[in-house]
Amino acid sequence: MARGSVSDEEMMELREAFAKVDTDGNGYISFNELNDLFKAACLPLPGYRVREITENLMATGDLDQDGRISFDEFIKIFHGLKSTDVAKTFRKAINKKEGICAIGGTSEQSSVGTQHSYSEEEKYAFVNWINKALENDPDCRHVIPMNPNTNDLFNAVGDGIVLCKMINLSVPDTIDERTINKKKLTPFTIQENLNLALNSASAIGCHVVNIGAEDLKEGKPYLVLGLLWQVIKIGLFADIELSRNEALIALLREGESLEDLMKLSPEELLLRWANYHLENAGCNKIGNFSTDIKDSKAYYHLLEQVAPKGDEEGVPAVVIDMSGLREKDDIQRAECMLQQAERLGCRQFVTATDVVRGNPKLNLAFIANLFNRYPALHKPENQDIDWGALEGETREERTFRNWMNSLGVNPRVNHLYSDLSDALVIFQLYEKIKVPVDWNRVNKPPYPKLGGNMKKLENCNYAVELGKNQAKFSLVGIGGQDLNEGNRTLTLALIWQLMRRYTLNILEEIGGGQKVNDDIIVNWVNETLREAKKSSSISSFKDPKISTSLPVLDLIDAIQPGSINYDLLKTENLNDDEKLNNAKYAISMARKIGARVYALPEDLVEVNPKMVMTVFACLMGKGMKRV
């Protein structure tokens, strides 16, 4: 059964069905995903029957015997097995299945086997954090404060306002407040808010592939908590980064270079920060945020170390009462410790039980919040440090990083160049753009201590080879060594082509496989503007008129008539601030009408042709879907 004999409508349904089963989004259905599908669908079937059906589907569907079902094989299953019991059960399972959670993971208290389980502890922690964060926001009075002991949270996120606000607290200025619908909400304006929240979450690097507006509207607990955790974590980690917090250099160890320290993730830096203070207190180090902190002793000493000593003007001393250390009962000791944390204004995220159970997620959040409030680090006067090497990432680098993370690459990319030095993330991105990777050729970690870099270099060579031969990228003068060493210009050249191809692939899928290039996008933009009787047009993605954002705003209004409030815009003789104001509105409005835009307002103002292209391409995708 060739794709050609499937109608467009049926193809859309099949794609949707396939995406429901392919929960990890890698383009293939595995045995486990089939198993999970039947569990999640809650069909009245005994375990052995589920196993039989799954095995049957794998046996008949996996035509090339690679242990997984591709989309083409999936089409054949649907057509070839229409009448059988197995196929009927399979279809029923897909139809019954609600959004399977593919975020993060379950917490320590929940389990793999239960699809809809969620952590009460997380809910309690997040509600208290959000209540505190939004307590003075007039737009949230209708839901704040939420009761942490009820399902308030899952109802509160349903209109999108709280999510938008939390995203802006984590990464300020992500969402233009003017675009949030706040009054007299209707199902349509709620949908817009949820689009805005989800697309903005994606733009700050949240992995939201398997979360839809419906899931949030319905308040599906595991999806809501998964998204909130990502948003909260991004906010907590924002300053745990060397270029934004130079005092972290105090954590440099003997014989270590600044470069080594810069490669550490926020989690690793936090652990190192805690151990730096524990060492100063003459205590044992901790190796994790779970079992090693269960007795609260490390926390006691950490609080004592970071508490203000009264040597800073306007910051009164806080003397930590250490008597609770003598408590025999773990829970009691944890409670006493948290009372001391409260005196620092840092009793957040964990209860005494969370400490004693060693809940890693919530303990990480507790420590991150403590770090943000009381880092207690001093920038060393050591002259050997090359401060020039501390420059932060560029906007473009951050956009690329957020794009990768939003696609769910593993592990998360914290530092663009060092985290790509073994090419593993690049291989995952190739898979996302439908370039097949032979994983047998890839060296996988853990890498040996001796010759480890050689293994990484081999990966990088293969990544460049795939780019040239399979993806047909223009990679003249780029070798594996450039990726391995983190050559900025050459690494960015490859990443840009990956992002461009990803964007064009989405457009081509919507357009039924028709090839797309820059000229086609520009023509579509102008044609759409003309049909909507808009006066603006663009000659290319370098057109200076784009700096006003008016072509983008007009296009949004053409795609969704009446969506743009032109009273908020400056249209003539714009100065830089006015251009930025228009651009902020344009980017948020694009996300609000459903376009997954990663570009930043500054990209429009500066007419960065690469990012401008992605904006128009995403809008074109949105416009074509509407037709």
Epitope: F289, G408, P446
Partner: nanobody, 124 residues
Framework: QVQLQESGGGLVQAGSSLRLSCAVS????????VGWFRRAPGKEREFVAA????????YYADSVKGRFTISRDNNKHTVDLRMNSLKPEDSAVYFC?????????????????WGQGTQVTVSS
């Protein structure tokens, strides 16, 4: 050559505890997820627990939830599985394995490197 080495197995009475440890020799765990699996005689390999590279996201099989705790120490490059309230049905050879992508932590087929295993026997 990188090798995973499990330790801590043994023969214990039902209701007691054990702590298994997985160490990497010749390399460092770095940013890889680590899972524990077990195989009882005549049975299929079964997922037990897993932890992502940072130790923050943990996963458990229903059968061990609340009794077993997985944690990792990235300074020592070890991943521990603390097993409490052991039952005779927990008897098996326990293996640790690494998976850098960690998209499907419960799926043994996704894991890249495996240890030799350590025997756990729980008598009633």
């Amino acid at each position: 050559q990188v090798q995973l080495q499990e330790s801590g197995g043994g023969l214990v009475q039902a209701g007691s505890s054990l702590r298994l440890s997985c160490a990497v020799s010749g390399g460092t765990f770095g940013r890889v997820g680590v899972g524990w699996f077990r195989r009882a005689p005549g049975k299929e390999r079964e997922f037990v627990a897993a932890v992502n590279w940072s130790g923050i996201d943990t996963y458990y099989a229903d059968s061990v939830k609340g009794r077993f705790t997985i944690s990792r120490d990235n300074n020592k490059h070890t991943v521990d599985l603390r097993m409490n309230s052991l039952k005779p049905e927990d008897s098996a050879v326990y293996f640790c394995a690494t998976d850098f992508r960690f998209n499907a932590p419960m799926n043994g087929a996704e894991y890249d490197y495996w240890g030799q295993g350590t025997q756990v026997t729980v008598s009633s």
